[in-house]
């Protein structure tokens, strides 16, 4: 098992912006915005100016019962956040069709803003979460999930798309971030590292976790993804960190046991329906939230990110299976498929719980550095 206690870290929430034109041109970075050291090569995601978004009202759902025993982020040690040593690289790319700029990859040419100008936006994902700087927002109620326990039939498509492993979800999985903030789940996918190298996209005080699950949702205000891209709140992603624990995770095993069948890029298989909520942490009440973007091109903004405080435990063998089974284009392994963390550029990450309160004896009074923007009130 990993680290025992992770101290609160970075901001989520309030002020990230969406694009009015989903995949339209954004202002590209100005000269003084130079690439950050921890960016993988070819991914100079420099800020461009944009209008700040208004927040959309969305829906409410039913809290999930709490289970004990999973590691919590606030139980992990504080770690320094130097430039990330493990550069995301792409092992999922082939320049088979010449200079096609839609052939993006991790950690190499072409630079992502050339693939999609939105990737140079000011409010990108992933980010480093620093709980001490998060704004406690009591208005952030427990997430509500409905219909996530799927019957075995119909089966679901599990595909190696060259960038990740993706499970396409059927209609009927409903999620609410709060009253009037309702969404439908579309798909889930994972990000991971390589042997001895963690591969989560978000970090907590610079700590990168072994892997991360993303469940992507479409707002019920939109019928299709193409209508929602770049609209504030049009898409919402539930994200959870995957950690090493002593036992096999039976929910994840239903997917991991099938990865060999889709080892080759582009291959797919059908898997029986399963309880999707079992792939997420049990505590739906403690999370960080901020507005960011898709973490792969086209990098459209306006995406509401909800990052669980509680982590999910997989066995060492399962994490190895995840990072060591799939292949990308050519003869390269599909590994280290994460984007470098992006600057907050003034965004404040919100927390549904007092993550920034220092309970150590040093502080006479609990200190919360940022105040809640009361989104959703």
């Amino acid at each position: 098992q990993r680290l025992p206690r992770m101290q609160e870290d970075s901001p989520l929430g309030g002020g990230s912006s969406g694009e009015d034109d989903p995949l339209g041109e954004e202002d590209l970075p100005s000269e003084e915005d130079s690439p950050r050291e921890e960016d993988p090569p070819g991914e100079e995601d420099l800020p461009g100016e944009e209008d700040l978004p208004g927040e959309e009202d969305l829906p409410e759902v039913k809290p999930k019962s709490e289970e004990e025993g999973s590691l919590k982020l606030e139980d992990l040690p504080t770690v320094e956040a130097p430039g990330d040593p493990q550069e995301p690289q792409n092992n999922a790319h082939r320049d088979k069709e010449g200079d096609d700029q839609s052939h993006w990859r991790y950690g190499g040419d072409p630079p992502w803003p050339r693939v999609s100008p939105a990737c140079a936006g000011r409010f990108q994902s992933p980010v480093d979460i620093r709980p001490q700087l998060a704004a406690f927002c009591p208005a952030l109620r427990p997430l509500e999930l409905l219909g996530f326990q799927l019957p075995p039939l119909p089966e679901l498509r599990l595909r190696n798309n060259g960038h990740s492993v993706q499970l396409t979800l059927p209609p009927g999985l409903e999620m609410a971030l709060g009253p009037g903030r309702e969404y439908r789940a579309l798909q889930l996918h994972l990000h991971w590292g390589a042997a001895g190298r963690p591969g989560s996209e978000h970090t907590v005080e610079g700590h990168r976790f072994p892997a991360e699950i993303h469940v992507v949702h479409l707002s019920t205000a939109f019928a299709r993804v193409d209508e929602a891209l770049g609209r504030p709140g049009g898409l919402a992603v539930l994200a959870a960190f995957l950690e090493e624990g002593p036992e096999e995770n039976s929910a994840y095993e239903q997917l991991l046991s099938r990865l060999e069948e889709i080892a080759e890029e582009g291959s797919e298989t059908q898997v029986p329906g399963l309880d999707i909520s079992a792939l997420l942490p049990s505590d739906f009440s403690r999370y960080f939230q901020y507005e960011g973007s898709l973490t792969t091109p086209p990098c459209a903004q306006g995406v509401i990110w909800t990052v669980f405080n509680q982590t999910v435990m997989l066995s060492a063998k399962q994490l190895h299976t995840l990072s060591d089974t799939l292949w990308g284009p050519g003869d390269s392994r599909l590994q280290l498929n994460f984007r470098a963390t992006q600057p907050l550029n003034g965004r404040v990450i919100e927390a549904s719980f007092p993550a920034g309160v220092d309970s150590s004896p040093r502080a006479a009074e609990p200190v919360q550095l940022n105040s809640c923007l009361a989104a959703g009130d």
Epitope: N161, G162, H163, Q166
Partner: nanobody
Framework: QVQLQESGGGLVQPGGSLRLSCAAS???????????MAWYRQAPGKQRELVAV???????KYSDSVKGRFTISRDSAKNTVLLQMNSLKPEDTAVYYC????????WGQGTQVTVSS
């Protein structure tokens, strides 16, 4: 609203060739540059099956039944995906559907391919 439109189907003799095309249209047609594109087919009374897929990185995958006879390609600039079908057999008779997988599935209406003498 984005739409996928297949064309190129028809009646062909065994051993013959056809070239199916799938064109994307609509305001946000750009997103198909970032979609895995695939051809599926459905024969009468059978389940829809994957024929071929091309990922955003240009990687291709074929079902065993068409390997070596069919070729999938994409022209991202023109938002089209092609399926070149050679050495056609009667068992290739089906409705062929174009699919784009970008966060959700987009489907065309299908085009009929009939292989018969």
């Amino acid at each position: 609203q984005v739409q996928l439109q297949e064309s190129g189907g028809g009646l062909v003799q065994p051993g013959g060739s056809l070239r199916l095309s799938c064109a994307a249209s609509g305001n946000s047609v750009n997103i198909f540059r970032f979609a895995a594109m695939a051809w599926y087919r459905q024969a009468p009374g059978k389940q829809r099956e994957l024929v071929a897929v091309i990922t955003t990185t240009g990687g291709t995958k074929y079902s065993d039944s068409v390997k070596g006879r069919f070729t999938i390609s994409r022209d991202s600039a023109k938002n089209t995906v092609l399926l070149q079908m050679n050495s056609l057999k009667p068992e290739d008779t089906a409705v062929y559907y174009c699919n784009a997988d970008y966060l959700q599935d987009y489907w065309g209406q299908g085009t009929q391919v009939t292989v018969s003498s």
